[in-house]
């Protein structure tokens, strides 16, 4: 399935929202931990009849800065947005393509965790990690260190009472030439690749460097889990657990409410706050489901994690284009229509009066009065000479007549307004040009 319509090219981008995982949150609560918008991906145009490709995605890392301590457990929402690049009024149109959400446990400073999330027909593969900015260190970025070269007293900008570590770790030096955008290292001298990149220096894109792939029988997805085959390939962790490789095997970091080697055991209760977006949690009567989320309007899914596609209800009338902006629905109306749902027909002559026997004509996105002979102006209130506008082409002579104007055409012309030359080539008989000969600039006649 292509993300673009056949008519318009589009490009994708991501919005990431992070929230503290343990706090009770109201509906549409802010992204308290942080939020970020990715760069736009390359322009993609659907090729009719071609198999669904992996999609060109925004390049490089998406960093979400967080101000306070890293909470360890966090909720994320990743939205994939489509930007249509047609010549719409008001600039490009945005629409939400896919939305995934989850709750994870992650220590700062740890290795990259990998994840696969599915939303409808889309599968999103991504890696993530939490990293402290110096001088903060530790699994929650709450401890401070001082550089080796700094004196032992507190450096500038550090609170005097903050406990100082002995020394900051020396910054890791990756393998020379390791791509700063697509590679990273956890040991000096190595170069490990992010999703979608391979090669000794992580400069070679895997397939189309895309890790957003349509699922289904028509498309073979190119695996974007890099490096090569490993214990975390295919993500053995169930229920949204994130997989980390260990020297001998793998380790699953389970979201709150799941445990076991592969996060396969569920122990989620309402006390764990599993309902997103202000969903109301009720203890389930069925022993197999420890809770049920009752979702607020606009959300669905077992954890209220999915936004309802309100545009599927086709709220925009008269062929208007529906845009779900998250906080509101917006209708982009076709020419000649207006109103929040494009319900007002601007071309509608109802209630419009044309004076002096004029008739209202609909069309072109505006009302127009077709005035009776001798009247003109927007509402036919002005007296007019019907011949003043020179309505006869090619030198035809205009005569005002009680039933309308009459054009007396010059020789060689015909039509109600003398607009058609009988022999447009003039006197000379030209050899017939074969069809397809490109005409020149338009001829201009008075």
């Amino acid at each position: 399935r292509s993300p673009c319509s056949a008519r318009l090219p589009c490009r994708l981008f991501f919005r990431v929202c992070l929230k503290p995982g343990l706090s009770e949150e109201a509906a549409e609560s802010p992204c308290a931990l942080g939020a970020a918008l990715s760069a736009r991906g390359p322009v993609y145009t659907e090729q009719p009849g071609a198999p669904a490709p992996d999609l060109p995605l925004p390049d490089g890392l998406l960093q979400v800065p967080f101000r306070d301590a890293w909470p360890g457990t966090f909720s994320f929402i990743i939205e994939t947005w489509r930007e249509e690049l047609g010549d719409q009024i008001g600039g490009p149109a945005w629409s939400l393509l896919a939305r995934v959400a989850g709750r994870r446990r992650l220590a700062a400073g740890g290795p990259w965790a990998r994840d696969i999330q599915r939303a409808g027909a889309w599968e999103l593969r991504f890696s993530y990690r939490a990293r402290c900015e110096p001088p903060a260190v530790g699994t929650a970025c709450t401890r401070l260190c001082r550089p080796r070269s700094a004196p032992s007293r507190c450096g500038p900008g550090l609170r005097p009472c903050a406990p100082l570590e002995d020394e900051c770790e020396a910054p890791l030096v990756c393998r020379a030439g390791c791509s700063p955008e697509h590679g990273f290292c956890e040991q000096p001298g190595e170069c490990r690749c992010l999703e979608g990149w391979t090669g000794p220096l992580c400069t070679v894109p895997v397939s189309t460097s895309s890790c957003l792939s349509p699922r289904g029988p028509s498309s073979a997805t190119t695996g974007c889990l890099v490096p090569g085959p490993g214990p975390c390939d295919g993500n053995p962790c169930a229920n949204g657990g994130s997989c980390s490789e260990t020297p001998r095997s793998f380790e699953c970091t389970c979201p709150r409410g799941f445990y076991g080697l592969r996060c396969e055991v569920s122990g989620v209760t309402c006390a764990d706050g599993p309902c997103f977006n202000g969903g109301l949690c009720v203890g389930g009567a069925d022993p197999d489901s420890a809770y049920i989320c009752h979702c607020p309007p606009g959300f669905q899914g077992s954890n209220c994690e999915k936004r309802v596609d309100r545009c599927s209800l086709q709220p925009c009338r008269n062929g208007g284009l529906c845009l779900d902006l998250g906080h509101a629905l917006r209708c982009r109306c076709r020419a000649g229509f207006a109103g929040p749902r494009c319900e007002h027909d601007l071309d509608d002559c109802a209630g419009r009066a044309c004076a002096n026997g004029g008739t209202c004509v609909e069309g072109g996105g505006a009302h127009r009065c077709s005035c009776a002979l001798g009247f003109g102006g927007r509402d036919c209130r002005e007296r007019a000479d019907p011949c003043a506008a020179r309505p006869c082409a090619h030198g035809g002579r205009c005569y005002a007549h009680f039933s309308g104007l009459v054009c007396a055409c010059a020789p060689g012309y015909m039509g109600a307004r003398c607009e058609f030359p009988v022999h447009p080539d003039g006197a000379s008989a030209l050899p017939a040009a074969p069809p397809g000969l490109r005409p020149g600039d338009p001829q201009r006649y008075l």
Epitope: G363, G364, A393, G415, E419, P424, P439, P442, R444, Y445
Partner: nanobody, 117 residues
Framework: QVQLQESGGGLVVAGGSLRLSCAAS????????IAWYRQAPGKKRELVAG???????NYVDSVKDRFTISRDNAKNTVYLQMNSLQPEDTAAYYC???????????WGQGTQVTVSS
Amino acid sequence: QVQLQESGGGLVVAGGSLRLSCAASGSSVSFLSIAWYRQAPGKKRELVAGISTDGTTNYVDSVKDRFTISRDNAKNTVYLQMNSLQPEDTAAYYCYAYRWVGRDTYWGQGTQVTVSS
């Protein structure tokens, strides 16, 4: 700038029918006076039928009662329905537009109609 694109020409046996289409872009056909012309080899280009902005139609005598010109504002296209075609109707058929704003004339690139006996 108005662009005109003709289609629908082809080879037909005498007595048969064809419908030519003239699709306009750059302006609405409701604001244009549009006509069909034809040109046989070695002859002058001649008017066949025309439709004015107010819907008035004109035909040359040789095609009256056989050809019908019409327009579809929604499709921004003008049509020439040609019935009872004769070998003397063989020609390249061209679409012509007269735009009242600026009083410019525009031509399409033509479509070939061949009537065999």
